[in-house]
């Protein structure tokens, strides 16, 4: 007799390893012989897909290498035309042992930044990921973390972080490693011994000192007035990341001596500073065919201004060039009661620039003034109002004494940098914030269309000096 | 010597996009400031944008805040102009210019070397 | 945003003439001004900056001028190599302007 047909085996919930075989039975009594079609996720299994067995008479699902993706609700459909057609469904929950899909790679890191080692893994049940480092397992802290991706992130890497680490993928199923990858940390080249500044007789052997170190170990180079040094010997010595340079110089001049500590990180570099000046004992008496003399800037009022251990010109036409130099900055500014936060820096800068020229030595000594384009750019950017006050209070006379003459530059008679850039001097970068240029005065557009970024803002308010490193 | 040579003009759809570069030699990038400026067959200069890397500061004209961005880079001594959501108004010669100094003081330079130019064509 | 007017949009002139073209900025601005100088098929020449500071190489037969709002390029006698387009510029702190144009032709 006809019968409808009844699956007296239900689907059941199968858990199959990837690459594995995983069968689903779908036992069917009825007559005559029923239909059974087999759906994944109700999208029908194709007869001849290759990836499937179907046997039987259609009661068994066989798939061959279960990957991934199988994931899903399976049913099968009996039918034979004797009633309704039955259904029947049960899961495939694919297990995976754990696999890392994405390793970690070797990384060199500059100190302080944040460094992250990837570890992305698979697996099912979802696997957790932890870190050895050397043979102890990572802990860990406020700076260390492993995120919800597996990845590790260092927040301000240090030297200590430095070393051979691996992450580890563990589930129910087994466990994975990934190889060993090196975390090395950079560190910017830094002087930790400057050369010192020396007045000696003419014709005496000075030696200056320069000790740096960093990651990897900086390279010293010795700059005499500006150029590479031509004359004397230079001892080397490398210890524990420490290089240790002596310049031993025979003088006939007077002299800037700059130790500059380099090292590379990639394709950039790093550089470290220090300057000594080497005065010649008779040669501080200006001869009678000079106007002033190269000196080191030893004064209060442009501390922050001028680059530390500047060279300045002093002007012998003062009897004390620096007591009435530095008299002329502090009466300049006793002039200027109410400064904006804008202008107070560029204006602090051009001023100690100016009176404090920088200063060439040589037979005779020579002052470098401002180009005429940064001192345009204070008198018209930055200080447009407090220019006109006190270009106006020097017509009227009302700077104390004569001094008022060389308060504030006349841009126009200064040289341009595109007649000689060697023969001025730049006004180093302000230190900008944002706070700051909101007082910007309106010279162009009353929304500037521009992206400033938020630099440090100088303590002093001042224009900063060269940083301990800097990067080219 | 001081040289500006721009690339990566061509034939662009409306609403696609292309990336001109500006290959720097005989001066620093980080130490300059660089401008993009467009000028449309028959017509008059037209300014773009521009960088200052030591800043890391950069400007757009209105016409083209929003699709228009410049960058630099300065191991390569290059600087770049990316430009998406190109309209037909965009078809111009797109020259690099380079000026002296940072953001503000490099007004005062005037735009002293200037590329050959690029040709930059929006059609459909 | 400022606007720079530059009048006339062309001129004839002979060799040998005095010829002199200004730019209007529609607003106070600073001496951030320069001239260049195009000719066709090619990029444009800086000639003046700092709205009177002759560039390198430039002839001295060329020289800028500031009053007020009004930027002055004169070309005190004009040679034949000087037929040519002249623009100004203005450069703010934030924003760049060029003037529209002057082209120079030979009467």
């Known amino acids: 007799l006809p019968k409808a047909p009844v699956i007296t085996t239900p689907l059941e919930t199968v858990d199959a390893l990837v690459e594995e075989v995983a069968t689903f039975m779908c036992a069917v009594e009825s007559y005559p012989q029923p239909e059974i079609s087999w759906t994944r996720n109700k999208i029908l299994i194709k007869l001849f897909d290759t990836r499937y067995s179907i046997r039987e008479n259609g009661q068994l699902l066989t798939i061959l290498s279960v990957e991934d993706s199988d994931d899903g609700i399976y049913c099968c459909t009996a039918n034979n035309g004797v009633g309704g057609a039955v259904e029947s469904c049960g899961a495939l929950q694919v297990k995976m042992k754990p696999k890392i899909t994405r390793p970690p790679i070797n990384v060199k890191i500059i100190e302080g930044l944040k460094a992250v080692l990837p570890c992305t893994t698979m697996g099912n049940p979802k696997p957790s990921v932890s870190w050895i480092k050397g043979d102890s397992p990572l802990r860990e802290n406020s700076r260390i973390a492993v995120l919800e991706s597996g990845s590790l992130r260092i927040h301000n890497v240090q030297k200590e972080d430095a070393g051979q680490y691996r992450c580890v993928a563990k589930n129910s199923l087994g466990t994975a490693y990934s190889k060993v990858v090196k975390l090395e940390v950079e560190v910017f080249a830094r002087i930790l011994r400057a050369p010192e500044s020396h007045n000696v007789t003419f014709g005496s052997f000075v030696t200056l000192h320069c000790t740096a170190t960093g990651i990897p170990v900086p390279t010293i180079t010795w700059i005499e007035n500006g150029n590479a040094v031509s004359s004397g010997s230079i001892q080397e010595s490398v210890k524990d990341r420490v290089i240790d340079s002596r310049l031993q110089l025979f003088i006939t001049k007077p002299g800037l001596y700059t130790c500059i500590a380099t090292n590379k990180h990639g394709e950039k570099f790093s550089t470290a500073k220090a300057a000594a000046t080497i005065s010649i004992a008779e040669w501080s008496k200006p001869q009678k065919d000079n106007k002033g003399y190269c000196a080191q800037y030893r004064g209060e009022v442009c501390n922050a201004v001028l680059a530390k251990d500047a060279l300045v010109f002093l002007n012998t036409s003062y009897a004390d060039p620096e007591e009435a130099q530095e008299l002329l900055v502090h009466t300049a500014w006793n002039e200027l009661k109410v400064v904006s936060p804008v202008c107070r820096p560029a204006a602090e800068a051009l001023l100690c620039n100016h009176i404090f020229q920088e200063c060439s030595p040589g037979v005779v000594p020579t002052p470098i003034p401002i180009c005429r384009e940064y001192c345009l750019a204070v008198k018209e950017l930055f200080c447009a109002k407090e220019w006109l006050v006190m270009e106006e209070k020097t017509h009227r006379g009302l700077y104390r004494s004569e001094m008022h003459l060389l308060s504030v530059p006349e841009c126009s008679k200064l040289p341009s940098m595109h007649w000689d850039p060697t023969a001025c001097a730049r006004l180093p970068h302000l230190d900008y914030n944002k706070e700051n240029l909101k007082t910007f005065p309106p010279m162009t557009s009353s929304k500037p269309s521009v992206d400033i970024p938020n630099l440090p803002s100088s303590s002093s308010s001042s224009f900063s000096v060269s940083p301990t490193y800097s990067m080219t | 010597e001081v040289q500006l040579v721009e690339s990566g003009g061509g034939l662009v759809q409306p609403g696609g996009s292309l990336r001109l570069s500006c290959a720097a030699s005989?001066?620093?990038?980080?130490?300059?400031?660089i401008h993009w400026v467009r000028q449309a067959p028959g017509k008059g200069l037209e300014w773009v944008a521009s960088i200052s890397s030591s800043y890391g500061s950069t400007s757009y004209a209105d016409s083209v805040k929003g699709r228009f961005t410049i960058s630099a880079d300065t191991s390569k001594n290059t600087a770049y102009l990316q430009m998406n959501s190109l309209r037909a108004e965009d078809t111009a010669v797109y020259y690099c210019?380079?000026?002296?100094?940072?953001?503000?003081?490099?007004?005062?330079?005037?735009?002293?070397?200037w590329g050959q130019g690029t040709l930059v064509t929006v059609s459909s | 945003d400022i606007q720079m007017t530059q009048s006339p949009s062309s001129l004839s002139a002979s060799v040998g003439d005095r010829v002199t073209i200004t730019c209007r900025a529609s607003?106070?601005?600073?001496?951030?001004v320069a001239w260049y100088q195009q000719k066709p098929g090619k990029a444009p020449k800086l000639l003046i900056y700092s709205a009177s500071s002759l560039y390198s190489g430039v002839p001295s037969r060329f020289s800028g001028s500031r009053s007020g709002t009004d930027f002055t390029l004169t070309i005190s006698s004009l040679q034949p190599e000087d037929f040519a387009t002249y623009y100004c510029q203005q450069s703010g702190v934030w924003l760049i302007t060029f003037g529209q144009g002057t082209k120079v032709e030979i009467k």
């Open positions: 005989g001066f620093t990038v980080s130490s300059s400031s």
């Open positions: 607003q106070s601005v600073s001496s951030a």
């Open positions: 210019a380079r000026s002296e100094g940072d953001r503000y003081v490099s007004g005062y330079f005037g735009l002293d070397y």
